[in-house]
Each structure stands twice: as C-alpha cells, then as structure tokens.
Interface confidence: low
C-alpha cells in the first residue's frame, strides 16, 4: 500500500470549503479499508483530534466541531480518500494526516500529510487620531483591523488628487501608523487607510482638521 505525495498545503478563505487530498495505491481489494483522518490543530498542537473515520464500510464522525461539515469527496470505499471541510473556521488551521490501512496489503507508506491554513480577510479597520490637532503639533494616524490572516498590511493615503501623504509624514505599513510632524493647514483633509492581505481589502476614513490658533482680541 502506498499513499501518494500530497501538495503539502492547502489555503482557503474562511467560510469556504477546503479539500484535503489523499489517495493511495493498493494490491488488495478494498474489502477491509480503514481510513482515519486526524488533525493537529495549530492552536493546540498537544491535542490531536479525529476528523472523520471510515471503518468496516461505515463512516464515523470525529470531533464534535467537525460534525456536519466533513465528508469524503467520493463514494467510499475508494482509493481516493480525500475529504472536504465545509464552512471552514479559523480553528480548522492545522496539520491533517490521513492514515490508510487495507488488509492484507501491508508495508509501504500509509500516511499522507497536508497542512491547512484558513485565511481571513481584514475586518473593517478602525481609524483613529492620536495627539493634538493644533497647528505645529505632531499627530499619529492609527489603523488596525481586529481580524485578518495573513496579518494585514496598512496603507495610508491622503484623498486629494495626489494620493500622497504630506512630506512631513512617515508611514509604518506593518503597524498601520502614520506620524505627521509639525502639522500645517496643508495637512488637513480626508485620509484613507487600506488594510489588505492575500485575500481581501477593507478601508476606513479619517478627517484630519488642523486647528489654527484664534487671533487674540485686543
């Protein structure tokens, strides 16, 4: 019995269906086929869980969280024992193993390993201003999404015809911050933060209005 090499890893957007491949060749009839799919969750590597089991011509549910979401992609018994996971959740990220036995066929590699990463687009980010908006002050524009896998990067733009930040601005696309030093009237305007990762983009807007000192009345 020989389990084929798998592609190594599968990436899927949260909520979509993941297909985890596993196929094998055997010299014996599929009368005593036994297939166990296990997962080592990324969130808890010490706690492997059963995903689905095929034994004695019957399918059995694995861990409760997979109930109703997991099945074999084809009619069993078969030499393609790939599974699907519907409505993928972040907690489904992990290393999946298919263990195949088909007596009396012994020997060879009977385990296939596939990594699953569930990707999450950035949630709508929060835009905030830190610091005084008085003329000549330094301000920090903050942007962050609660969700996003891979971790989002953040791009700040000033929504004028140039889409350029003021010359006194420095941007950190990893932290999602823009520091604008010595703000002037030209710093005023609408700023947009775009949070993006491999599978999604979301935005928030922020209105920066520089406050000029009131002329003193004599």
């Amino acid at each position: 019995l020989e389990v084929s090499e798998s592609p190594g890893s599968v990436q899927v957007a949260r909520g979509q269906t993941a297909v985890l491949p596993c196929a094998f060749s055997t010299s014996a009839a599929l009368l005593n086929l036994n297939v166990i799919w296990m997962v080592i969750p990324l969130s808890n590597a010490n706690q492997p869980e059963q995903v689905i089991l095929y034994q004695g011509g019957q399918m059995f549910d694995g861990a409760l969280r997979f109930h109703g979401r997991v099945g074999f992609t084809g009619t069993m018994p078969a030499t393609n024992v790939s599974i699907f996971i519907n409505n993928t959740q972040l907690s489904d990220t992990g290393t999946y193993q298919c263990l195949v036995n088909n007596l009396p066929d012994r020997g060879g590699r009977n385990i296939g390993v596939t990594g699953l990463t569930v990707l999450v687009p950035p949630s709508a980010p929060q835009c905030q201003i830190q610091g005084s908006q008085d003329l000549g002050s330094d301000v920090i524009l903050l942007c962050s999404s609660e969700e996003g896998i891979p971790r989002p990067t953040y791009l700040w733009e000033k929504l004028d015809n140039t889409l350029k930040l003021p010359p006194t601005a420095t941007q950190d696309q990893v932290q999602g911050t823009v520091t604008i030093r010595n703000i002037s009237a030209l710093s005023s305007g609408l700023y947009q933060c775009v949070a993006s990762n491999a599978i999604g983009t979301s935005t928030c807007l922020l209105d920066l209005q520089v406050i000029s000192p009131q002329p003193r009345s004599v």
């Epitope: 957007a13 949260r14 909520g15 999450v120 687009p121 950035p122 949630s123 709508a124 947009q192 599978i199 999604g200 983009t201 979301s202 935005t203 928030c204």
Partner: antibody, heavy 123, light 111 residues
Framework: QVQLVQSGAEVKKPGASVKVSCKAS????????MHWVRQAPGQGLEWMGW????????NYAQKFQGRVTMTRDTSISTAYMELSRLRSDDTAVYYC????????????????WGQGTLVTVSS | QPVLTQSPSASASLGASVKLTCTLS???????IAWRQQQPGKAPRYLML???????TRGGGIPDRFSGSSSGAERYLTISSLQSEDEADYYC?????????FGGGTKLAVL
C-alpha cells in the same frame, strides 16, 4: 438554514416614504453586515449601502445619502431600509443581502439575499 | 471609482460554450471580482469569486460547467454545455472603499 425574508410589495405616491423590512434567521444577526441593493425594472443592480447590525453603524452610497436610512432591531433580528422623498424612478425591487464575513473586503461576497420587495412609485 | 464594463447581451446554442467578459477600469486591474447569475424573477445568486491570477472559488452547488479565468483587466466567465436554465443575466461585482460596484450585466440567451 440561513434565510432573509422581506416584507411585501408596496405602492407609494411621489414624495412619500417607504420602509422595507428584512427578517434574518438561521445565523447570528449581529455578526454579519447587511447590505441593500435595488434593481429597477429591466435594469442592473445598484448598491445602496450597508448597516452593521451590531453597532448600528451605516455606510450609504453617495447617490442615496440624505434620502436613505438603514436601521435594525436586534431583538427581532430585523433590518430596515427607509427611502424618503420617493420619485417614479425609485420604482424597483429592493433586496437585502447578508455579507458572509461581517465586514468589507474583496472576498466577502453577499450571500444569501432576500426574495426582494417590489416598491412601485406612482401618482 | 472603478468601473466594470460588461457587454449588454450574448447568445449561444444549447450544449455549446459561451465566454462572458467583465473589464475593470485602469488602476483597478488587480481586483478580484464575483460573478453572479440572476434568473428571470429571482434574486441574484453567487457563482464564484475570481482572482486576478485566474484562480476561482465556486459557490456551493455551482456546477463545474461554470469556470473563471483572467487576463489583465479582463475577467471571464465560461459556461460550457449550455442548458436552458443558464438563460439569465450575469453580473460582475467588486468591493471598493467600503462600497459595492456592479457591472451593467450581460443578458445571455440560449438558442
């Protein structure tokens, strides 16, 4: 299963307002943004805006700003879209549509949609 | 604001294949789109998410007769082995700056 059920057809006079409801079931109402899209007879789809049922925050398409109000009642898992100062060209089918992941982003396509509510504006 | 351009109509024979096009305006050619189908008198249903690299994810229950591909600013929806129920309007759509943008739609006639 997830379902969005909208209120029935309405006939309104120009200048009046209409309020369409969308009752959600089969999922956590506050976990997913709700969008409204309309379609005039024989025309394409037009996005009107969204409401975050959790916070009540809204984002309206510029075209409808000042005329549309989106609200929700979390106790009965229902979203509402009110359009005021109706004109004859507001005659359309109005759809509510759930955002699968609860906020904006290019992979978050509407699914599912309500069955649509026909609003006819006629004097 | 990005613009999505679709041909107003297309036609093909029963059992044949047809390729519908959605063109993204310049500056937005790396956007993913969604294809939707709207059968007469029904709400639009999700067909697939189509990325700029041509990779696509079909919605639940969508047969593999529906496939997507991309080239530059063009996003394609190919329907093979056309069936009478494929006669419908097809829309492409994107998310941009917290808003949805729809193409004008293509009315597909199955002859």
């Amino acid at each position: 299963q997830v379902q969005l059920v909208q209120s029935g057809a309405e006939v309104k006079k120009p200048g009046a307002s209409v309020k369409v409801s969308c009752k959600a079931s089969g999922y956590t109402f506050t976990g997913y943004y709700m969008h409204w899209v309309r379609q005039a007879p024989g025309q394409g789809l037009e996005w009107m805006g969204w409401i975050n049922p959790n916070s009540g925050g809204t984002n309206y398409a510029q075209k409808f700003q000042g005329r549309v109000t989106m609200t929700r009642d979390t106790s009965i898992s229902t979203a509402y879209m009110e359009l005021s100062r109706l004109r004859s060209d507001d005659t359309a089918v109005y759809y509510c549509a759930r955002d699968p992941d609860g906020s904006g982003g290019s992979s978050r396509w509407f699914d599912p949609w309500g069955q649509g509510t026909l609003v006819t504006v006629s004097s | 604001q990005p613009v999505l351009t679709q041909s107003p109509s297309a036609s093909a024979s029963l059992g044949a294949s047809v390729k519908l096009t959605c063109t993204l305006s310049s500056g937005h050619t790396n956007y993913a789109i969604a294809w939707r189908q709207q059968q007469p008198g029904k709400a639009p249903r999700y067909l697939m998410l189509l990325n700029s690299d041509g990779s696509h994810t079909r919605g639940g229950g969508i047969p593999d007769r529906f496939s997507g591909s991309s080239s530059g600013a063009e996003r394609y929806l190919t329907i093979s082995s056309l069936q009478s129920e494929d006669e419908a309007d097809y829309y492409c759509m994107i998310w941009h700056n917290n808003a949805w943008v729809f193409g004008g739609g293509t009315k597909l006639a199955v002859l």
